[in-house]
Amino acid sequence: KSSNEATNITPKHNMKAFLDELKAENIKKFLYNFTQIPHLAGTEQNFQLAKQIQSQWKEFGLDSVELAHYDVLLSYPNKTHPNYISIINEDGNEIFNTSLFEPPPPGYENVSDIVPPFSAFSPQGMPEGDLVYVNYARTEDFFKLERDMKINCSGKIVIARYGKVFRGNKVKNAQLAGAKGVILYSDPADYFAPGVKSYPDGWNLPGGGVQRGNILNLNGAGDPLTPGYPANEYAYRRGIAEAVGLPSIPVHPIGYYDAQKLLEKMGGSAPPDSSWRGSLKVPYNVGPGFTGNFSTQKVKMHIHSTNEVTRIYNVIGTLRGAVEPDRYVILGGHRDSWVFGGIDPQSGAAVVHEIVRSFGTLKKEGWRPRRTILFASWDAEEFGLLGSTEWAEENSRLLQERGVAYINADSSIEGNYTLRVDCTPLMYSLVHNLTKELKSPDEGFEGKSLYESWTKKSPSPEFSGMPRISKLGSGNDFEVFFQRLGIASGRARYTKNWETNKFSGYPLYHSVYETYELVEKFYDPMFKYHLTVAQVRGGMVFELANSIVLPFDCRDYAVVLRKYADKIYSISMKHPQEMKTYSVSFDSLFSAVKNFTEIASKFSERLQDFDKSNPIVLRMMNDQLMFLERAFIDPLGLPDRPFYRHVIYAPSSHNKYAGESFPGIYDALFDIESKVDPSKAWGEVKRQIYVAAFTVQAAAETLSEVA
């Protein structure tokens, strides 16, 4: 049967019927329902929500909806022994203590089981010592401290402001610098937008608000005790000493009221420049230690959290494909939250729920997609992408053979300014074409397309008249699908104006104030941005699952490969003498990119011309498109990061959230001037160029005529 025979809705109306069925009011109701109590991973409340979603997805009409459970390492504060930080005097007396909880928002005063702010997976400990302020605790911040300012963090407690990079990278950097503890805080410069009130009167962070979050450095491993394999009933678990990615020093987060008390006493060196100063009324001195009268006072951390193997539950829904049931298009987003999850994740989960309902409505009317659609409600994303990774580990053989695409669906909004898309280049044309067909929800763009408002507000830095689409990094559930398995992936959400709002993320991220009311009052009262995101995510899934020829354009990969090759070459050319000395050449990489470009062009011509009524040829061409992303996977992985296997993209070694292109070469070149053995270091650069060139060439050959 052709896909048209699998439906009683005419093909022209398929997508329209699906999109028209999506309703803002439903998303609003679902968001309300999902945010009334906390849904922390590993808790009974989150298990109950999993069962509710399972039941509702069945009602919506999916063919099957199952729970997939795993027993993974999670982390919780000790209920009877709270975490806090003190300033102690020379006698050891605590003269100041940080707060033990966030003041609850109005209407939530009597809610139980609000987990207090903590850094998940922090080891226990009570270190005391002098404080050093390390700005954002980025690699370059520690370079500034150690190499330029000659400040030694060894044996110190460091205080770092949240923002710019993933908190796990901050902790890793502090550990490498020899720190014995880390205090993370939210500075108003990054989490308080000028001219906006604090919650509950606006969307800014109040002084008592604190960002929770995990501080792991998993590098794609999933459950720290079962890297590479599912944490099932018969799993062999590593001992805690061998667990992947756990921090070795105590870490704790605080709000800016408490941070003020610590930072106002700082002595030592003045900050190096304006980029180290936040918005508190403190000097932002770096230290080490307190100034003058306070120089005998120290900081002491009291951390008593515990790591526990705990059961988590994914919800996996299936809508079987009519023509190619063995080809999977996956829409997944997480369900677990730190507290209420008003934005993260439930603004995304509510959108997924409505997408499932719409697909279910079409199915009840007799329609089926061409390919199978899998819907996932992931657990324990906040604890290191654990639910999605364990499920993918369990199903890796199926996924690597059958996975067409993965669309991520975490927070639908982080602002209400314009669209933000990160995806594989294979999806660029799909996203462009889809957004040209959707209406913009933006004020001043009535009657205009989403593509038009997006392009106007977020223009591509390279191509005029086109919108910015970013590289995929990590920090969300697409990681295992894209970085490990090589399944074409994408994500979309509404975002802030990055030009005018310099704070990191959104101010109330991972705080108790991320409530339904935050969204309904301040971000999206009409839920029109949520609806638009539902249309983008759902529209992408629809096209990927239903189009006869997969909506991937391999020529867009050719374009970015050339751009990335130019970029990495220019980085290397900052060392012309060494390149000459060690005979470093990028010729092989540029040659491979050239071959890829030519072969991709010829493939695209064949794609226009082939007989689409021949199911064997159609399947063959679609398989070449599906497996192209897979061809960029190196089975050996990146150096010291075996679960990051994509040669073109990986999460930055310095910021998990950011994507890096040609990461193997990039990391080999990074800080190469400081390496003790230049010959060995440049040898590794050459090896990484070889790996990249081979991989690009091998990928190109998958697009060649098969015989």
């Epitope: 370059e140 500034k144 060196s269 400081s674």
Partner: antibody
Framework: EVQLVQSGAEVKKPGASVKVSCKTS????????IHWVRQAPGQSLEWMGN????????TYNQKFQGRVTITVDKSTSTAYMELSSLRSEDTAVYYC????????WGQGTLVTVSS | DIVMTQSPDSLAVSLGERATLSCRAS??????VDWYQQKPDQSPKLLIY???TRHTGVPDRFTGSGSGTDFTLTISSLQAEDVAVYFC?????????FGAGTKVEIK
């Protein structure tokens, strides 16, 4: 070997501006703070401001009331100091120095302000 | 602004003898103090940073000490090449400020 090479001496009229350059070599340019310091004839040293070449973050001595601008060109590993609305008391030797602790110094540039 | 007061203004010491230079800050600066040497018609050179750490290549006859408001640079055995003006500088707060200098001569 770390080297900071400054541009040559300048003679300026009051009210004019001067831009002094400082070309660095022998180290990773983005790694060290660049400071500008001046020394009037027979006098002590006076700190004018600094810049982080990695991100362009600056701090200035408020005494110069917005008259001083420090910039960098990463592509040439060069720092610049521009002083505007010159007056006779700005006559001095202007030094660039690399490193938070002024680890390495340029040779100095004499700027003479005279009508 | 923090005022750095150096004393004495000048100091004459016999070759091989000890020279002790003082620098006082108008408020507590912790150990955020550097010492520089400037020879006639030359750029200054860094000697001591963080009050007591010798910069690379600086002879061990130069020693820095002190914290809070009182700092000392000691030249344990004066050599002919040590004739110069010595400046202290604080970097505990902006603007960074220098002392007026101590001129060291041979007696």
């Amino acid at each position: 070997e770390v080297q900071l090479v400054q541009s040559g001496a300048e003679v300026k009229k009051p009210g004019a501006s001067v831009k002094v350059s400082c070309k660095t070599s022998g180290y990773t340019f983005t790694e060290y703070t660049i400071h500008w310091v001046r020394q009037a004839p027979g006098q002590s040293l006076e700190w004018m401001g600094n810049i982080n070449p990695n991100n362009g973050g600056t701090t200035y001595n408020q005494k110069f009331q917005g008259r001083v601008t420090i910039t960098v060109d990463k592509s040439t590993s060069t720092a610049y100091m521009e002083l505007s609305s010159l007056r006779s008391e700005d006559t001095a030797v202007y030094y660039c120095a690399a490193g938070w602790n002024f680890d390495y110094w340029g040779q100095g540039t004499l700027v003479t302000v005279s009508s | 602004d923090i005022v750095m007061t150096q004393s004495p203004d000048s100091l004459a010491v016999s070759l091989g003898e000890r020279a002790t230079l003082s620098c006082r800050a108008s408020q507590d600066v912790g150990t955020a103090v550097d010492w520089y040497q400037q020879k006639p018609d030359q750029s200054p050179k860094l000697l001591i940073y963080w009050a007591s750490t010798r910069h690379t290549g600086v002879p061990d006859r130069f020693t820095g000490s002190g914290s809070g408001t009182d700092f000392t640079l000691t030249i344990s055995s004066l050599q002919a090449e040590d004739v110069a003006v010595y400046f202290c500088q604080q970097y505990n707060s902006y603007p960074r400020t220098f002392g007026a200098g101590t001129k060291v001569e041979i007696k």
